[in-house]
């Protein structure tokens, strides 16, 4: 399956926080989305192959890495002034 | 590769039919439809892969356009349990 952690996160002003996303489905592609209350998903970053990732529609204030097929951590940087949201990770073949 | 869904909001009577659409200017190798209930993560309903494909899931019918740039979700005889946020992803 696909596992995201932590389930809840509080961030101090000016801090960077990292959300973990791990999958054991052998999927090549991984995605991070942000969902604000009552809204649909907006793509932050996606990766289709190890060592490569591309910006989605709202990449500002976020960073990612893809060093392993199984893992695609998302860092919410201090530059993200409005980080409060529901974050979703997804994977696909 | 932005996907646009329409309509954004839909309120119907029980027993009515409804169709929601998902469009893009880009080609997708596959499209997924999800349903999300308040406070929960999205639940995958279906993945469509082949252009022109039609998939049925009880009262739900999913279509993938021939050019693989659009998809639709049709619900026949909607019920209160169908209430939720429907999301299209590619």
């Amino acid at each position: 399956g696909i596992t995201q952690s932590p389930k809840y996160l509080f961030r101090k002003e000016g801090q960077n926080v990292t959300l973990s996303c791990e999958q054991n489905l052998n999927h090549d592609a991984m995605y991070w989305y942000r969902q604000d209350p009552g809204q649909g998903l907006r793509l932050i970053y996606y990766s289709q192959i190890v060592n490569d990732f591309q910006k989605g529609d709202i990449a500002e204030g976020y960073s990612v890495s893809r060093e392993k097929k199984e893992s695609f951590p998302l860092t919410v940087t201090s530059a993200q002034k409005n980080p409060t949201a529901f974050y979703l990770c997804a994977s696909s073949i | 590769q932005l996907l646009e869904q329409s309509p954004q909001f839909l309120s119907i009577q029980e027993g009515e039919n409804l169709t929601v659409y998902c469009n893009s200017s880009s080609v997708f190798s596959s499209l997924q439809w999800y349903r999300q209930e308040p406070g929960e993560g999205p639940v995958l309903l279906v993945t469509v892969v082949t252009g022109g494909e039609v998939k049925k899931l009880k009262r739900l019918t999913f279509q993938f356009g021939d050019a693989r740039k659009d998809s639709s979700l049709h619900i026949t005889a909607a019920q209160t349990g169908d209430t939720g946020l429907y999301l299209c992803a590619g």
Partner: antibody
Framework: EVQLQESGPELVKPGASVKMSCKAS????????MHWVKQSHGKSLEWIGY????????NYNQKFKGKATLTVNKSSSTAYMELRSLTSEDSAVYFC?????????????WGQGTSVTVSS | DIKMTQSPASLSMAIGEKVTIRCITI??????MNWYQQKPGEPPKLLFS???TLRPGVPSRFSSSGYGSDFAFTIENMLSEDVADYYC?????????FGAGTKLELK
């Protein structure tokens, strides 16, 4: 029918730069990645990098960072590769090749190649 | 980078014989292996893509197998038109990497 038409052979002096082109037809240019591959005489193939014409995203093989620059012109469906500070090691045939954007598959259609000779 | 060890470097076979080329990777790449044929003066031609998928128009005498780190490309009954260089390519990981190639000649 998918076609990738590459520019003609180049004879250039050491230290100079060269910019080659690859004109795509028969498909929607922005729907697919464009890769560039080097083949030195009698040798194997080396992947240089790729560009996504839709958003200009590039990814380079570390070995070619600073040597190659990939660009596109969407309106003419043309991809370009510029090589700088040329040496005899850069003498080779360079191919452009396309691959689908999603999923990330191998290159399925290739140009005929551009021969670059670096000589004083 | 994922290193690809392709063998043999060259091969001389008679018409009708079975040809096998191997490619071994230093790390597991699942089924993300591709095989190309290149004839003199031409660009490479994709024969098999990921998942041992035979590409359209490629003769059925060609086959490909393997998963993980050990892969094989086979020509069941060699024909004179199969004389070419053959390359494996991994597409699991960037940078994409090719094998050193196998030159197939007619005996």
């Amino acid at each position: 029918e998918v076609q990738l038409q590459e520019s003609g052979p180049e004879l250039v002096k050491p230290g100079a730069s060269v910019k080659m082109s690859c004109k795509a037809s028969g498909y929607t240019f922005t729907d697919d990645n464009m890769h560039w591959v080097k083949q030195s005489h009698g040798k194997s193939l080396e992947w240089i990098g790729y560009i996504n014409p839709n958003n200009n995203h590039t990814n380079y093989n570390q070995k070619f960072k600073g040597k190659a620059t990939l660009t596109v012109n969407k309106s003419s469906s043309t991809a370009y590769m510029e090589l700088r500070s040329l040496t005899s090691e850069d003498s080779a045939v360079y191919f452009c090749a396309r691959s689908t954007v999603v999923p990330f598959y191998a290159m399925d259609y290739w140009g005929q190649g551009t021969s670059v000779t670096v000589s004083s | 980078d994922i290193k690809m060890t392709q063998s043999p470097a060259s091969l001389s076979m008679a018409i009708g014989e079975k040809v096998t080329i191997r490619c071994i990777t230093i790390t597991d790449i699942d089924d993300d292996m591709n095989w190309y044929q290149q004839k003199p003066g031409e660009p490479p031609k994709l024969l098999f893509s990921e998942g041992n998928t035979l590409r359209p128009g490629v003769p059925s005498r060609f086959s490909s197998s393997g998963y993980g780190s050990d892969f094989a490309f086979t020509i069941e009954n060699m024909l004179s038109e199969d004389v070419a260089d053959y390359y494996c390519l991994q597409s699991d990981n960037l940078p994409l990497t090719f094998g050193a190639g196998t030159k197939l000649e007619l005996k």
